[in-house]
Interface confidence: medium
């Protein structure tokens, strides 16, 4: 049997001649050269040689754990005389010892970290690492520990972890922004001999809002005309703020002062200034100064440096308003008025009025622009502002009027303002309803009582509030004696029914009917509307064969009450297309 | 016989939405103009708006507390009234009435009515 | 707008009294003045249209008279079917209704 154990070598060796590794031995081998000793697998013949007599092992080269820490390989022990072999082949391993020849290296050259100013101690910051290739389970050769050469006071590292966390208390950044921090790796524990390695790391101290704005300056003073409308800027004010970005940020608002509802500040987000504008019309005759307290706050506030003092600062802005002479200001800025249509000349409408709101106060006079009144359908009393009619109104003529009142000052006539005036005309029920259309109708001879031959609708240019309803009878002087009645809906349409039976064109070949319409509004207007009703020979469908001559050349045509139409230039037997009159033989 | 029917009436959040219809039938429903009314419980009764009829250009009108909110449109082909009432509010509950506008701007035939509770 | 002020807000009478209501405009409304009668539970029924026009089928005991901004409802004879609540309504310009006069049994 072969006899020998696992085989050492330590790498890296460094003598002159081959390295001896160990020796194969077969108990078979009774030294008389009879056998002979073959070597196989990774680096035989090569990296490793053997004495084929004597079975010692060397190695022809310097090893390198890191490299490749362990070599398997194959022993076989021959008869020489018959080449057989006297021992099963078997395997074999060489392991390469290691010794501590590589240093620790960090996974990065240089870190950058960043961590937040007036953290507290302890803060972790950034981790960093470092690996060394010796081997971690024989020795301290691969045991590192870390340890800072730069950057004392204010960073510590973990000698085991490579943590690297804040030393020292109250770093601002406003004083000191950057710092570069050495950081040695060592191996073997950190003992003397040990290998070492160093990496850089660049932390940078990040904002965080520990500073208020601050005005440099505790008042401010700035002057704006009277005339400046809503929304012009008057003056800017900066507040610093020695923090950045949005710590940095500011807002203004007005706090106090009389000027409170008259001006706004805003803020400029790019310049980071506040920008005193005008919120509402000024008066130099009502205030000629305002004095405001302007405040300058930070909105993103940090709650644990609330302990340093509130976080805003206020300054006292000065407005002077400037004196320009205005025109005359009405009370409002339009007036709707309205008036009856059937208002009598001189009618009061109703009053305009005007007031220069300089101090002096000059009286105004007031007047119509005729451009929006050409017909001078109204009038002002040029001292009181009074509206009132020179014209009859109508309504269905014009429902609204709109004219221009001008107020001018007396002492100033260069100084004038105007002023629509909406005048709306109020529906009074002053006309009749009439009929919707011309109508002219026929009835058959054979026509039977209590037949519907016409539908009525009417119109009325009055437009009453909850819309038009209107009732139909025959006039009272043709109610009794009329051979045709009126129907009533009671939907605004009424239909013209035969009376009797059968009607005689050779004893009256036209009928007219005298319809009253009434429009049941207040006060009542009515009409009386003539319906020609012809009376016609008719087949036993209903259709019209001869009728008078009149009603053959008329324009507009006859109606059966569906709409149907006469053409004068139709042939007398398809003179109707339309619905057919009911026929009862 | 003349005849006013509401529905849609039920419980609905602050600010949420609801319509109601009323349905006519015994008389020319398109000649004529109607109107809206509401009575809070235990309350009077408060005109909330009208449409005028197709001859009268489907005009409407609303009363102040609604106006933006409410809009009353109308279907002659069925017959039928609408009040789409949006951005409920709680003092919007009440019973609401359709009634039929009739000469001298009184109404001569009202609906049953149905009641709109606004509430949280 | 036209406000409307009925009075009394309420009254107790017996079967067979007169009754009178009174309703007072803002303003002028020519005579565009109606009248109305509600049950619990019911909707407003048409009495008066025009200030003094009845309304077909209102029993003739009940009218109304006035012009201008005053106007007034009478029942000549109560019944046990008039105890209600009644409403004046203007109609001259959009509408708006009284407060109304609940009448009771006494």
């Known amino acids: 049997s072969w006899m020998w154990n696992q085989f050492f070598l330590l790498e890296e060796y460094t003598g002159s001649d081959y390295q001896y590794v160990g020796k194969l031995h077969s108990d078979q081998d009774r030294g008389d050269g009879s056998l002979k000793y073959i070597l196989s697998g990774d680096g035989a013949g090569d990296l490793f040689i053997i004495n084929e007599n004597t079975g010692d092992i060397q190695a022809t080269k310097r090893l390198d754990r890191e490299e490749k820490p362990v070599y398997i390989l194959r022993a076989q022990a021959v008869n020489r005389r018959t080449g057989r072999p006297v021992e099963p082949e078997s395997e074999f391993i060489i392991k390469i010892h290691d010794i501590n020849d590589n240093e620790p290296i960090f996974t990065k050259d240089v870190y950058t970290a960043t961590v937040p100013e007036m953290a507290d101690v302890g803060t972790f910051v950034v981790q960093v690492t470092a690996t060394d290739a010796d081997d971690p389970t024989y020795g301290n050769s691969a045991k590192v520990v870390y340890s800072i050469l730069q950057g004392q006071p204010y960073f510590s590292v973990e000698s085991e972890t490579g943590i690297i966390k804040t030393a020292l208390l109250n770093m601002d950044r406003e004083n000191r922004e950057q710092y570069q921090v050495v950081i040695q790796a060592k191996d073997m524990g950190g003992q003397m001999g040990g290998l070492s390695g160093t990496t850089t790391v660049n932390i940078t101290l990040t904002d965080v809002n520990d500073n208020p704005p601050r005005f440099p300056q505790s008042t401010y003073q700035f002057k704006t005309p009277e005339s400046s409308p809503p929304g012009t800027p008057i003056g800017r004010i900066k507040a610093s703020d020695a923090d950045v970005g949005e710590n940095a940020e500011i807002e203004y608002s007005i706090t106090d002062g009389e000027g409170h509802e008259m001006f706004d500040v805003i803020t400029d987000q790019e310049t980071q200034e506040g920008i005193i504008t005008v919120k509402k019309l000024l008066d130099f005759e009502k205030k000629k100064v305002y004095t405001l307290k302007v405040e300058a706050s930070n909105p993103h506030v940090e709650p644990r440096f609330l302990y340093l003092g509130p976080f805003k600062d206020s300054a006292t802005v000065r407005i002077v308003v400037d004196d320009v002479d205005e025109p005359p200001v009405f009370s409002k800025l339009a007036y709707i008025l309205q008036i009856r249509e059937d208002a009598r000349i001189n009618t009061t409408i109703g009053s305009v009025a005007a007031q220069d709101p300089d101090a002096a106060r000059n009286p105004v006079k007031y007047s119509v622009d005729r451009h929006t009144d050409m017909d001078r359908i109204f009038n002002i009393d040029s001292g009181n502002g009074s509206i009132f009619t020179s014209k009859l109104l109508d309504r269905e003529t014009l429902l609204w009027h709109n004219i221009t009142v001008i107020a001018t000052e007396i002492n100033n006539p260069k100084q004038s303002s105007r002023v629509p005036l909406y005048i709306k005309v109020l529906d009074v029920n002053d006309n009749a309803p009439e009929f919707a259309e011309f109508y002219e109708t026929f009835v058959c001879e054979k026509a039977k009582a209590d037949q519907l031959i016409q539908t009525l609708r009417a119109v009325d240019k009055d437009d009453p509030y909850s819309g038009h309803q209107f009732s139909f009878s025959l006039a009272p002087e043709a109610a009794s004696s009329s051979n045709f009645t009126i129907q009533d809906n009671k939907d605004n349409t009424a239909g013209i029914l035969t009376r009797k039976n059968g009607y005689n064109r050779h004893e009256m070949s036209t009928y007219l009917l005298p319809v009253v319409i009434s429009d049941n509004d207040y006060p009542v207007q009515s009409s009386t509307g003539t319906v020609t009703v012809r009376v016609c020979a008719c087949d036993h469908h209903g259709n019209m064969q001869s009728c008078h001559a009149e009603a053959l050349i008329h324009p507009t045509g006859l109606s059966t009450g569906a709409g149907s139409e006469f053409r004068h230039d139709s042939g007398l037997n398809d003179i109707f297309e339309a619905q057919k009159i009911e026929w009862h033989e | 016989q003349v005849q006013l029917v509401e529905s849609g009436g039920g419980l609905v959040k602050p600010g949420g939405s609801l319509r109601l219809s009323c349905a006519a039938s015994g008389f020319t429903f398109s000649s004529y103009a109607i109107s809206w009314v509401r009575q809070a419980p235990g309350k009077g009764l408060e005109w909330v708006g009208f449409?005028?009829?197709?001859?009268?250009?489907?005009?409407?009108n609303y009363a102040a507390p609604v106006k933006g909110r409410f809009t009353i449109s109308r279907d002659d082909s069925k017959n039928t009234l609408y009040l789409q009432m949006n951005s409920l509010k709680t003092e919007d509950t009440a019973v609401y009435y359709c009634?039929?506008?009739?000469?001298?701007?009184?109404?001569?035939?009202w609906g049953q009515g149905t009641l709109v509770t606004v509430s949280s | 707008d036209i406000q409307m002020t009925q009075s009394p807000s309420s009254l107790s009478a017996s079967v067979g009294d007169r009754v009178t209501i009174t309703c007072r405009a803002s303003?002028?409304?020519?005579?565009?003045l109606n009248w109305y009668q509600q049950k619990p539970g019911k909707a407003p029924k048409l009495l008066i249209y025009r200030a003094s026009n009845l309304q077909s089928g209102v029993p003739s005991r009940f009218s109304g008279s006035g012009s201008g901004t005053d106007f007034t409802l009478t029942i000549s004879s109560l019944q046990p079917e008039d105890f209600a609540t009644y409403y004046c309504?203007?109609?001259?310009?959009?509408?708006?209704f009284g407060q109304g006069t609940k009448v009771e049994i006494k």
């Open positions: 009634a039929r506008i009739r000469y001298f701007r009184n109404w001569d035939y």
């Open positions: 309504q203007q109609g001259d310009s959009s509408w708006t």
């Open positions: 449409i005028k009829s197709n001859a009268d250009g489907y005009t409407t």
């Open positions: 303003q002028t409304i020519n005579s565009y």
